[in-house]
């Protein structure tokens, strides 16, 4: 059984205020069973950016159809970027658990920074 790897290919992503940013994340295995969530930052202060299972995240769309059984692409797009969106974004795999899912593995992170001034 292949060990799960979380791949975030870009270390740095330069974005423009007002535009859409695409944050890439792919996994190398479908196991263990459980969701992939996106966070900005690490530790207890991290911000939840996207959770497929619950919540409403109006500025976030997924690149792939996460409902497909064999999907391994958990990349997201964040629209209408502002200066307050800068930071390092992590895709994090959770293992299905009861009563709560358990964090299993995190990607290495992609730092989002402003690459152009707003017009």
């Amino acid at each position: 059984e292949e060990e799960l790897q979380m791949i975030q290919p870009e270390k740095l992503l330069l974005v423009t205020v007002g535009k859409t940013a695409t944050l890439h994340c792919t996994v190398t295995s479908l196991l263990p069973v459980g969701p992939v969530l996106w966070f900005r930052g690490v530790g207890p202060g991290r911000e939840l950016i996207y959770n497929q299972k619950e919540g409403h995240f109006p500025r976030v769309t997924t690149v792939s159809d996460l409902t497909k059984r064999n999907n391994m692409d958990f990349s997201i797009r964040i629209s209408s970027i502002t200066p307050a969106d800068v930071g390092t974004y992590y895709c994090v795999k959770f293992r299905k658990g009861s009563p709560e899912n358990v964090e299993f593995k995190s990607g290495p992170g992609t730092e989002m920074a402003l690459g152009a001034k707003p017009s």
Epitope: G18, R40, G45, L48, S80
Partner: antibody, heavy 118, light 108 residues
């Protein structure tokens, strides 16, 4: 979406008070939450914010070191612990849900009146 | 720190007429501006977000425009129930979140 504040009242300067905000009708643990206050006859002043998981907090300079925001995601409840209260803290305190992690306030509670008077 | 200045402080308009409220930011806030309505003795209510988008359940007589530093809230045909204080809020730079000082709309 419903947000209901409680815990307001009359206290003397230097005393403490804890406000609660019971949330329902949405996935509470997925959203950042805020406290906003309004002094009598005045405008709106943002007080504090807490991120969805509860580990990240921000405060207005006017309350930093005296107020503590917290949340219990298992109970769908937001709190504001207010210590060393001053007369200028007298206000209606509203809890407000944030639209996303970096957004405006899309739902407001009805407010809790805090009066600090000797 | 971004400062929001609302004008006029008070606006007196006859029923059925147009009301135009202004909010000016001290630096660009892109389109990240919301408008909230607060009726006497009530909590604020979201009207407009991202400068131009009406919130759920808001009548279409309310519209928002502008970007950068200058924003306008327009009530196309004022109703008696629109008597309230209107606040703008920016969420481009934070913390802190900032509100304007408010515009009180009175019915003539």
């Amino acid at each position: 979406v419903q947000l209901v504040e409680s815990g307001g009242g009359v206290v003397r300067p230097g005393e403490s008070l804890r406000l609660s905000c019971a949330a329902s009708g949405f996935s509470f643990s997925s959203y950042a939450m805020n406290w906003v206050r309004q002094a009598p006859g005045e405008g709106l002043e943002w007080v504090s914010r807490i991120n969805s998981g509860g580990g990240g907090t921000d405060y207005a300079e006017s309350v930093k070191g005296r107020f503590t925001i917290s949340r219990d995601n298992s109970e769908n409840t937001l709190y504001l612990q207010m210590n060393s209260l001053r007369a200028e803290d007298t206000a209606v305190y509203y809890c407000a849900k944030q639209y996303d992690w970096n957004g405006f306030f899309d739902y407001w509670g009805l407010g809790a009146l805090v009066t600090v008077s000797s | 720190e971004t400062v929001l200045t609302q004008s006029p402080a008070t606006l007196s308009v006859s029923p059925g007429e147009r009301a135009t409220l202004s909010c000016r930011a001290s630096q660009t806030v892109g389109s990240k501006l919301a408008w909230h309505q607060q009726k006497p003795g009530q909590a604020p209510r979201l009207l407009i977000y991202d400068a131009t988008n009406r919130a759920t359940g808001i009548p279409d007589r309310f519209s928002g425009s502008g970007s950068g530093t200058d924003f306008t809230l327009t009530i196309s045909s004022l109703q008696t129930e629109d008597s309230a204080v209107y606040y703008c809020q920016q969420y481009y730079y934070w913390p802190p979140y900032r509100f304007g000082g408010g515009t009180k709309v009175e019915i003539k």
